[in-house]
Structures are given as structure tokens and as C-alpha cells.
């Protein structure tokens, strides 16, 4: 049951990080003060408990929730267009690659989709960035902030993603 | 909660083309497709094609390459359907639909159609 | 590609009664998706069910969704005068995305 996740993804994966260091438009140093720790659920990444589909579930919904936070209006306002568009391109193709494989992991089983917990928590880690840049005002700082949050998150799930690649 | 808003009702000359808006509000996302349903009077729905507004990538149904295009602007949310070579079995009410980002997992959200506009009729006659 | 045959075409009950709707494909469909829509008269679709089996927002929990490969069904336990109304099933296929819907089943007042 295995699926073409392996080449596509990581490779885009790769390109994801590359863009978002291109998106950094002032310096870390200048925003220390703003730091924040958004607590990244990285017991959801491991990969121990999961089965292929809930692991492809949970990483599904850490991209989307990425392409949903950089899609806003503010979003817009504050970075390079051009790089935005890159970065949206990496995340939709990150997308399909996931929905593809999930579409060949269930075929017409009734392999459970997902921990509802763990989709839940990702969410919530979500939620508190949308909520941090709400606080402050969406401002040049805060976006820095959450442009590396972000980075860190895409680097610290891969681990999931290499274990999806073994896992057959 | 997104609210999607069609323009009005419009009647067509067989050949011609028509031009069909849909406005989304709400919490919106340009990462969620927009979809184009339509509906024959007395009949079924029928998917037409989608666009990822973010991106302006689309998909179309077989049956209406060719003659169908959907493009969309990032702001205001906008999605536009355009159909051509119009013939009157076209005549139809013309839906716009779009998923939700509550749905859990994301990964089944773009699969379905939480959210529907109000419809725009769209009449073929000669 | 797939097509969704509903059945029956018409249904005539009385409320209180309960009635069961069929969807058919005619090649195996995961139940993850599979939806069910609601649709009256003069009105926009209504998304009912999702992932073969989960209720969306505010729909009443005498609505229910079942079944798995080819064979999915749509149970109202006791309708009540609001649930007469035409019902889609739509499965979805990817890639390309492909969404596909049923003729419907139309609910009737006996």
C-alpha cells in the first residue's frame, strides 16, 4: 500500500524551507523581544503510534492550516508576493502529494482517517499563532516570529515524514 | 461561518457566452477551492470544475472542456464562472460552493461542500 | 469514472416514520468520501453527512450515514415535517479531483 510520497515530498518539503528563509525581510535580532513559544505538539510528529493514514491526516493538516495562516489579507500585506506564490505552490503540491497517497492508503477499507486528539492539538498550536498575531497587531515583528515558527515546525515534522517513507 | 453571494439572473442567446460572480465572505480562505455546481430545472447537481483562488489553479469536468473557464481575484474573495458556446440544455440554476476549515481532518474538507451560494439562473432561450 | 446510483427514486412516508436511502457506485468508493446533501425546494444543497458516517454542523442526529465499497445508505430514525426534501449522495476522486453526484432521492409526504 505504499504511495509515491517519498521523491515529491521531501523535495518539496525542502523548497518550502528554502522559500520561507527568502521571506525573512528583518533581522531575528531586532525581534527577541517579541519571541513567543507557540508549543509545537512534537509528540504528534514522531510517528510512533500512527498508522500511515492518521500520520498522513496529521501532517495534511499542518500544511493546510500553514497555507491558511500565509493566505490572508495580512498575510499578503507583509510578504513578497512572488515568494508568497512560491511558498503557496510548495504547500498545494505538498497537498496533493498527501491527498494522492491517502486516496491509495484507504482504497475501500475502513482504515481510521485520523486521532482526533492529534488533529485537534495541531489545530489548537494553530490557533495560538492566529491568536499571537492578533495581539500584535499583525505587525512586521510578529510575522518574523511566526515566519520561524513556521520553519521550525516544517523541520521538526519531517521526522513523521521519513518514517511515512519507511513505513510500508 | 462563509457566505458566498452570486450575481443575478441572466438570459442568453444560444452560441453566446455568460459570465457568473461569486462573492465569498466570512471566514474565508484563498488555500480553500471554489466550485461551480450547476442544476437543470427538475434535474440533479452537477460538478463543473473548481478553482484555488490563491493560486488561480482549476480543474474542469470532462463534459464542459472546452467551453467552461473559472478564474477568481484574492481580494475581495471572488470566484467567476465562465460558460461558452451556450446551448439551451445549459439552461440551469448555476451554484457556487466552497468546503469549510472546521472540517476534521482537513484532509476530508475539500472533498465535499459545506458552504452554497444562493444560485443564479441562468436562462437559454432564443 | 464513477457514477452514484440512488435508489428509490421517490419515497412516500408518513412523519414518524423512518426511511432508509440507498447510493450505489459502480466501482469501489472509500466511505471517508462519501457525502450526503439535503436539498428543498427553491433552496441551495445542504451538506447533511461527510466521511460516510459524521454529521456536520447542526444536523440532528436522526439523520445517519452508513455502509462501505459500493454499497452506502442514508437513515432518517423519525421524520419529522422539515426532512421532506430531495437527497444527493456525492463521492469524491482524486487526482485529478473529480466530484461526482447522484441522481437523488426524492421524500414525499404520503
Known amino acids: 500500500l505504499g504511495c509515491d510520497l517519498p521523491q515529491t515530498h521531501s523535495l518539496s518539503n525542502r523548497r518550502t524551507l528554502m522559500i520561507m528563509a527568502q521571506m525573512g525581510r528583518i533581522s531575528p535580532f531586532s525581534c527577541l523581544k517579541d519571541r513567543h513559544d507557540f508549543g509545537f505538539p512534537q509528540e504528534e510528529f514522531d510517528g510512533n503510534q500512527f498508522q500511515k493514514a492518521q500520520a498522513i491526516s496529521v501532517l495534511h493538516e499542518m500544511i493546510q492550516q500553514t497555507f491558511n495562516l500565509f493566505s490572508t489579507k495580512d498575510s499578503s500585506a507583509t510578504w513578497d508576493e512572488t515568494l508568497l506564490d512560491k511558498f503557496y505552490t510548495e504547500l498545494y503540491q505538498q497537498l496533493n502529494d498527501l491527498e494522492a497517497c491517502m486516496m491509495q492508503e484507504v482504497g475501500v477499507e475502513d482504515t481510521p482517517l485520523m486521532n482526533v486528539d492529534s488533529i485537534l492539538t495541531v489545530r489548537k498550536y494553530f490557533q495560538r499563532i492566529t491568536l499571537y498575531l492578533t495581539e500584535k497587531k499583525y505587525s512586521p515583528c510578529a510575522w518574523e516570529v511566526v515566519r520561524a515558527e513556521i520553519m521550525r515546525s516544517f523541520s521538526l515534522s519531517a521526522n513523521l515524514q521519513e518514517r511515512l517513507r519507511r513505513k510500508e | 461561518e462563509v457566505q458566498l453571494l452570486e450575481s443575478g439572473a441572466e438570459v442568453k442567446r444560444p452560441g453566446s457566452s455568460v459570465r457568473v460572480s461569486c462573492r465569498a465572505s466570512g471566514d474565508t480562505f484563498s488555500s480553500y477551492p471554489i466550485s461551480w455546481v450547476r442544476q437543470a430545472p427538475g434535474q440533479g447537481l452537477e460538478w463543473m470544475g473548481r478553482?484555488?483562488?490563491?493560486?488561480?489553479?482549476?480543474n474542469y469536468a470532462q463534459n464542459f472542456r472546452g467551453r467552461i473557464t473559472i478564474t477568481a481575484d484574492k481580494s475581495p474573495l471572488t470566484a467567476y464562472l465562465e460558460l461558452s458556446s451556450l446551448r439551451f440544455e445549459d439552461t440551469a440554476v448555476y451554484y457556487c460552493?466552497?468546503?469549510?476549515?472546521?472540517?476534521?481532518?482537513?484532509?476530508?474538507?475539500?472533498?465535499?461542500?459545506?458552504?452554497w451560494g444562493q444560485g443564479s439562473l441562468v436562462t437559454v432561450s432564443s | 469514472e464513477i457514477v452514484l446510483t440512488q435508489s428509490p427514486g421517490t419515497l412516500s412516508l408518513s412523519p414518524g416514520e423512518g426511511a432508509t436511502l440507498s447510493c450505489r457506485a459502480s466501482?469501489?468508493?472509500?466511505?471517508?468520501?462519501l457525502t450526503w446533501y439535503q436539498q428543498k425546494p427553491g433552496q441551495s444543497p445542504r451538506l447533511l453527512i461527510y466521511g460516510g458516517s459524521s454529521r456536520a454542523t447542526g444536523v440532528p442526529d436522526r439523520f445517519s450515514g452508513g455502509g462501505s465499497g459500493t454499497d452506502f445508505t442514508l437513515t432518517i430514525s423519525r421524520l419529522e415535517p422539515e426532512d421532506f426534501a430531495v437527497f444527493y449522495c456525492?463521492?469524491?476522486?482524486?487526482?485529478?479531483?473529480?466530484?461526482?453526484f447522484g441522481q437523488g432521492t426524492k421524500v414525499e409526504i404520503k
Open positions: 478553482i484555488l483562488p490563491a493560486l488561480g489553479v482549476t
Open positions: 460552493a466552497s468546503p469549510s476549515a472546521d472540517i476534521i481532518p482537513s484532509i476530508l474538507g475539500t472533498t465535499l461542500f459545506a458552504f
Open positions: 466501482q469501489n468508493v472509500s466511505r471517508h468520501y
Open positions: 456525492q463521492s469524491y476522486h482524486s487526482p485529478p479531483p473529480v466530484y461526482t
